[in-house]
């Protein structure tokens, strides 16, 4: 066909304009073009022909009939994207084509999951707090926005700005905590991230914090300690930074820390530490023990010839250190350690506190008073000073090794050591039965060193044989069992005195009160057998012309002999035990005097003893019979006072003739002590036992009663 | 009409390569990924990989990477799968799939079988 | 990889009844789950995407729901012509469930 007049080529009237779509939405593509005839349009994505509804009814892209291209759905997956690309319309008619401009179709995009999650955030108020979010991938880029607690916050508020993904509180207040949520939005949509949440915790802070204190040792001490924090903080405490040594403390429910009886270790700083999850804070307070002063050694009594020299100890402890000064009774002249010596005088003080009189003259003798003396209080202790021309009370002859008991053979040979010494020298004679012996006998000889000799043994010799060394000054005895049988040793074994142990070094008295004295020692030298035991002997010209073992069995070193008499001076000596028998005796112990009954002992108060012994709780346990004549007493003490001298064990009969008879009594009279043996009780009798503990005329509470049977014969093993 | 048509069965020796061809029709061959998915006797269906007809991408699981190869022409819109060092277990049926853009395998191929035995 | 797990293996039904199949991915796949339906002989076919969308020309006894880690098909009146073997496919990874074939009781 020809060309006609009035016929152009086609020219684009309406270029399509690039769009940004959501997957799933239609959209158009727009294109007019003009031209006659009227021009035939084709659209061509990415140079492809694009495929429409005229190619295939079932195509989700129409072309209408102005020419637009319409997308019923946007069609776009993860990896197939077949709408998405650059668009153009060609129009065409014989006349020629005429092709538009490119137009970009892209597909808006909001994927569901968030590059970064916000994550839940701790922090102390008034700390800044930082949410950080990354939103989904998404075209065109999503912006976000925050909610807290599904309201959307406002970014206006001078603490709060929204920078890049971050939500930022600069000051953080407890009412910011919450859960939030970031929001990532674009054309496609919204997407809301995991919730993160913001907890704003508050730092420990004291609402009351422990103070200094200054205490008297005994009391009891509390230091306050209270926090508040969210969380609630945690309460420790500490003693100069270290953790507290158990037992000691108790630690209140409201962190309280309590000390029932201070003592001078529980001086220092204690340190609360209130921690929780945001910070940590510490407050400190000293506690100062204050110790009333005590004495750590007394004064004694002394008796001390004219000319020698006499010290008299005093050592006190306390907190603060006391201050010792001495006086003797009736004279103004105080006496201070340190103190640079006045020219004729013979009394110094040393820096332990100890009095030190030189060249002693009658004139010195009296009552010496030593004071010690703190802000937290004043004792004081009385010693007498005796001067004499010499020591006139000379003590009895000294046993240094007796006879042993000893199992001897018919036709035997026995011999009986007795060696003695003393100021005269003493004589040694020896008692069989009480009666002298060896008489007329010619198989018995004492020999030049005292020893018993019998020869050529009988049975009859069977007996108790006792040596007596008497003097002047006295006279001291010393008895043994032999026995003769016919299965024996035929001689007595010679014990060596290497097989023994060495004697004991002087008692020393460290303690004296109207009944006791308490006395320490040494053993043996190194080298000499170790002791077992150790027996104690006592000597009293105004008790009896002989030394008297006052204490058996004796397992320490330290002990008090009890049972003395007041206002008495007495020797001691110690002997050392071992399976082989009796050390020589110790060097005698200096003279000393028991304390006068009549005033009051000092530096007591009567009402603390009173106080003390009624808090004392004995436990009474169940008692043994040990032989139908003898039954076991064992107790135990709650708390064991200052003020306790011994213990009273009180009996009576409750069945038989004499029951309800009344108390009868026996004294443990140390401290210490905690059982005692009743003896000479009748068989098959019940009896009523309680214990009483007691400090001089002072007596605590009564145990409980226990009842106890002996038996008709002695218990079966 | 939208359809993918696949190239006849086959018959190899193990050790021997095989090249499975897939045309397109009816649809813009370059707006949508290729998938190779194959079944052995008897068994499911497993995931071979795919293909960007675009630009010519592919992306293969670990156990058939190194052994698998795909390429397309868009001149005459097909698609290729190459499978090298045939064994007997390769044994199987292979289809060639469409990913709509639904994320979905909406076109198959008739499928074409693969029999490796000496 | 993300693991597909389909249960049951096999299952015997009769004509109008109900039918449900599951399928268990071993971690969250949001909505990215599609179903197939393949008979002996043939290609699969793809009955629902996106989890719960139905594909085109695709009955509407066929119905899928389902979000994270597990997901259903339902057929909520089988029909002869519905006894074959159903596949779960995630369009993460790709990767199929191990099928449940349906047969006659």
């Known amino acids: 066909s020809r060309l006609r007049q009035e016929d152009f080529p086609p020219r684009i009237v309406e270029h399509p304009s690039d769009v940004i779509v959501s997957k799933g939405e239609p959209t158009t593509l727009n294109c007019k073009a003009e031209g006659r005839p009227t021009p035939t349009i084709e659209w061509y994505k990415d140079g492809e022909r694009v495929e429409t509804d005229k190619d295939d009814p079932r195509s989700h892209r129409m072309l209408l009939p102005s020419g637009s291209l319409f997308f019923l759905r946007i069609v776009h997956g993860r990896r197939s994207k077949p709408d998405e690309g650059s668009y153009v319309c060609v129009a065409r008619n014989y006349l020629g084509e005429a092709v538009s401009r490119n137009a970009s179709l892209e597909v808006a995009l909001l994927r569901d999951d968030f590059r970064q999650n916000p994550t839940d955030v701790v922090v102390a108020a008034g700390e800044p707090a930082i949410l950080e979010c990354q939103p989904p991938r998404g075209h065109p880029e999503p912006t976000i926005y925050w909610k807290k607690d599904k309201v959307r916050i406002d970014d206006k508020e001078e603490r709060i700005s929204i920078r890049g993904g971050k939500l930022m509180i600069s000051n953080t207040r407890k009412s910011d905590a919450g859960m939030y949520t970031c929001v990532g939005t674009n054309m496609v949509g919204e997407r809301d991230s995991d919730p993160a949440e913001l907890t704003v915790f508050e730092r420990p802070t004291f609402l009351r914090r422990p103070i200094n204190q200054v205490v008297l040792e005994e009391e009891a001490v509390e230091f306050r300690c209270q926090v508040q924090g969210d969380p609630q903080p945690t309460v420790r405490w500490k003693k100069d930074d270290a953790d507290l040594p158990r037992g000691r403390y108790d630690i209140k429910d409201d962190y309280t820390l309590r000390i029932k009886k201070t003592m001078s270790t529980d001086e220092g700083t204690y340190m609360c530490i209130a921690e929780n999850r945001v910070g940590k804070m510490e407050a400190s307070a000293t506690l100062t023990v204050r110790a009333p002063p005590q004495f750590v050694v007394r004064p004694r009594d002394q008796i001390v010839a004219q000319g020698r020299t006499v010290t008299f100890p005093c050592e006190t402890k306390g907190n603060p250190q006391p201050a010792v000064f001495w006086q003797k009774e009736g004279s103004q002249n105080l006496l201070f350690p340190n103190q640079p010596q006045q020219p004729n005088s013979r009394c110094s003080v040393s820096p332990t506190g100890d009095l030190t009189i030189t060249n002693i003259q009658r004139s010195d003798a009296g009552y010496y008073i030593c004071q010690a003396l703190t802000v937290a209080g004043s004792i004081l202790a009385k010693a007498q000073l005796e001067v004499t021309d010499v020591l006139t009370d000379r003590p009895p002859p000294i046993i240094l090794q007796g006879p042993a008991n000893q199992t001897l053979a018919v036709d035997g040979t026995a011999l009986l050591k007795c060696k003695a010494t003393g100021d005269p020298l003493p004589v040694i004679s020896w008692l069989k039965e009480g009666f002298t012996f060896p008489g007329r006998d010619p198989r018995a000889t004492i020999q030049e060193q005292g020893t018993l000799q019998i020869k050529n043994l009988r049975i009859s010799d069977t007996g108790t044989y006792t040596c007596v060394a008497t003097s002047s000054s006295g006279e001291t005895s010393w008895s043994a069992v032999l026995d003769v049988t016919e299965s024996g040793a035929t001689i007595s074994k010679n014990y060596d005195l290497s097989d023994l142990p060495g004697p004991p070094s002087k008692p020393q008295v460290t303690d004296v009160t109207k009944n006791s004295v308490t006395l320490s020692w040494q053993p043996g030298t190194p080298g000499t057998l170790p002791a077992s035991a150790y027996i104690i002997e006592a000597f009293s010209q105004s008790v009896s012309n002989s030394w008297q073992t006052v204490a058996n069995h004796v397992k320490t070193t330290l002990y008090t002999v009890r049972g003395l008499r007041p206002n008495t001076i007495y020797l001691f000596m110690v002997r050392a035990i071992n399976p082989q028998g009796l050390s020589d005796p110790s060097p005698m112990s200096d003279p000393v005097r028991t304390q006068d009954i009549s005033p009051p002992a000092q530096g007591v108060d009567h009402r603390q003893v009173q106080k003390e012994l009624g808090d004392v709780l004995v436990r009474l346990h169940n008692p043994v019979v040990l032989t139908p004549t003898t039954v076991q007493v064992t107790w135990t003490v709650d708390r064991q006072p200052q003020f306790i001298q011994g213990y009273r064990v009180m009996y009576r009969q409750t069945s038989g003739l004499q029951a309800t008879s009344s108390w009868q009594n026996l004294d443990a009279k140390v401290p210490t002590e905690r059982s005692a043996v009743l003896v000479n009780l009748k068989k098959g009798v019940t009896y009523e036992i309680k214990v009483r503990p007691y400090f001089n005329e002072f007596q605590g509470m009564d145990s409980e009663s226990k009842t106890v049977r002996t038996t008709e014969e002695a218990p079966s093993a | 009409e939208v359809q993918l048509v696949q190239s006849g069965a086959e018959v190899k020796k193990p050790g021997a390569s095989v090249k499975v061809s897939c045309k397109a029709s009816?649809?813009?061959?370059?707006?949508?990924?290729m998938h190779w998915v194959r079944q052995a006797p008897g068994q499911g269906l497993e995931w071979m990989g795919w293909?960007?007809?675009?630009?010519?991408?592919?992306e293969f699981p670990q156990k058939f990477q190194g052994r698998v190869t795909m390429t397309r022409d868009t001149s005459i819109t097909t698609a290729y799968m190459d499978l090298s060092r045939l064994r007997s277990d390769d044994t199987a049926v292979y289809y060639c799939?469409?990913?709509?853009?639904?994320?979905?395998?909406?076109?198959w191929g008739q499928g074409t079988m693969v029999t490796v035995s000496s | 990889d993300i693991q597909m797990t389909q249960s049951p293996s096999s299952l015997s039904a009769s004509v109008g009844d109900r039918v449900t199949i599951t399928c268990r991915a071993s971690?969250?796949?949001?909505?990215?789950l599609n179903w197939y339906q393949q008979k002996p002989g043939k290609a699969p076919k793809l009955l629902i995407y996106?989890?719960?969308s139905l594909q085109s020309g695709v009955p509407s006894r066929f119905s899928g729901s389902g979000s994270g880690t597990d997901f259903t098909l339902t057929i909520s009146s089988l029909q002869p012509e519905d006894f074959a073997t159903y596949y779960c496919?995630?369009?993460?990874?790709?990767?199929f469930g191990g099928g449940t074939k349906v047969e006659i009781k």
């Open positions: 971690q969250s796949i949001s909505s990215y």
């Open positions: 009816g649809y813009t061959f370059t707006g949508y990924y």
């Open positions: 496919q995630q369009s993460v990874g790709l990767f």
């Open positions: 996106a989890a719960s």
């Open positions: 799939a469409r990913e709509s853009g639904d994320d979905a395998f909406d076109i």
């Open positions: 293909i960007n007809p675009k630009n010519g991408d592919t």
